[in-house]
Amino acid sequence: EEELQVIQPDKSVSVAAGESAILHCTVTSLIPVGPIQWFRGAGPARELIYNQKEGHFPRVTTVSESTKRENMDFSISISNITPADAGTYYCVKFRKGSPDTEFKSGAGTELSVRAKPS
């Protein structure tokens, strides 16, 4: 089996303020078992946007049914985008453990926010 890759096909996405942003992410393998997390930014100061395993993320919904068998699509939609949401978003695969540990990150998708049309 080939090692899992995290694919973020869009290098950049532009969304009008007030709209929803869809950030695409797929993985190429069911192995290893473990959750997906989304972050804005990289490094120690990165901001958690969504954690498949736990947490409450009222503005975030998953695009596909992530509980379904053989699902490899972990794209998310973020509602009511504001200029403060601009940044680079990373889809990160974690490996099951105590605690779960980071396994591989996607290349990132840069979100830019356009002014709300008048």
Epitope: E1, L30, I31, V33, G34, N51, Q52, K53, E54, G55, E65, S66, T67, K68, R69, E70, N71, K96
Partner: antibody, heavy 119, light 110 residues
Framework: QVQLVQSGAEVKKPGASVKVSCKAS????????INWVRQAPGQGLEWIAM????????HYNQIFKDRATLTTDTSTSTAYMELRSLRSDDTAVYYC????????????WGRGTLVTVSS | DIVLTQSPDSLAVSLGERATINCRAS??????????IFWYQQKPGQPPKLLIY???NRDSGVPDRFSGSGSGTDFTLTISSLQAEDVAVYYC????????FGQGTKLEIK
């Protein structure tokens, strides 16, 4: 950490019903399947059924399809397994188990609930 | 329905020696490029513990003396050097369709 806490032991008479609960913590309950498995004294493991708490999709072992019902309460992160028309050979430890990879496998287990069926 | 048959039913192995448990499926459990076989260890009075998933992948925290192999219909769980704490009953499970378990193999120390 993931925890599945099951309800206490039950003693039932033949023909009665039992409802076993499994309270989940340490993860988002609606994001992972829950399986139910039983083990009669000194015997092997027998898969009963599974439920997706996000939409209540269920799959049942044909042997239990007419007697078992799985439900969830997402407000309390609790899964339930009801077994009706109990017989003496339903005496077993009943386990709930969470499927962390949507592989129809059982990654994390509760400690089990002993159900004794005796007249 | 796919039936899993484990062999042997019981096994006694000396400490430090290799233990091998087999699991044969009545039809192939390979689908979408994966072998849908899992191995569990159950010690007395405890729930089962997942050891191996998708035939050959060790679960988190499982010692590397445990390994899984096989494809299609024939699968093996190997313990390369038996330790006292490995005494248990071992079960295979498939999920090519809805799950079923093998009947179990009891592993003891010789």
């Amino acid at each position: 950490q993931v925890q599945l806490v099951q309800s206490g032991a039950e003693v039932k008479k033949p023909g009665a019903s039992v409802k076993v609960s499994c309270k989940a913590s340490g993860y988002t309950f609606t994001n992972y399947w829950i399986n139910w498995v039983r083990q009669a004294p000194g015997q092997g493991l027998e898969w009963i059924a599974m439920i997706d708490p996000s939409d209540s999709e269920t799959h049942y072992n044909q042997i239990f399809k007419d007697r078992a019902t799985l439900t969830t309460d997402t407000s309390t992160s609790t899964a339930y397994m009801e077994l009706r028309s109990l017989r003496s050979d339903d005496t077993a430890v009943y386990y709930c188990a969470m499927d962390y990879g949507s592989l129809y496998a059982m990654d994390y287990w509760g400690r089990g609930t002993l159900v004794t069926v005796s007249s | 329905d796919i039936v899993l048959t484990q062999s042997p039913d019981s096994l006694a192995v000396s400490l430090g020696e290799r233990a091998t448990i087999n699991c044969r499926a009545s039809q192939s459990v390979r689908s979408s490029g994966y072998n849908w076989i899992f191995w569990y260890q159950q010690k007395p009075g405890q729930p089962p513990k997942l050891l191996i998933y998708l035939a050959s992948n060790r679960d988190s925290g499982v010692p590397d003396r445990f390994s899984g192999s096989g494809s299609g219909t024939d699968f093996t769980l190997t313990i390369s050097s038996l330790q006292a704490e490995d005494v248990a009953v071992y079960y295979c499970q498939h999920s090519r369709e809805l799950p079923t378990f093998g009947q179990g193999t009891k592993l003891e120390i010789k």
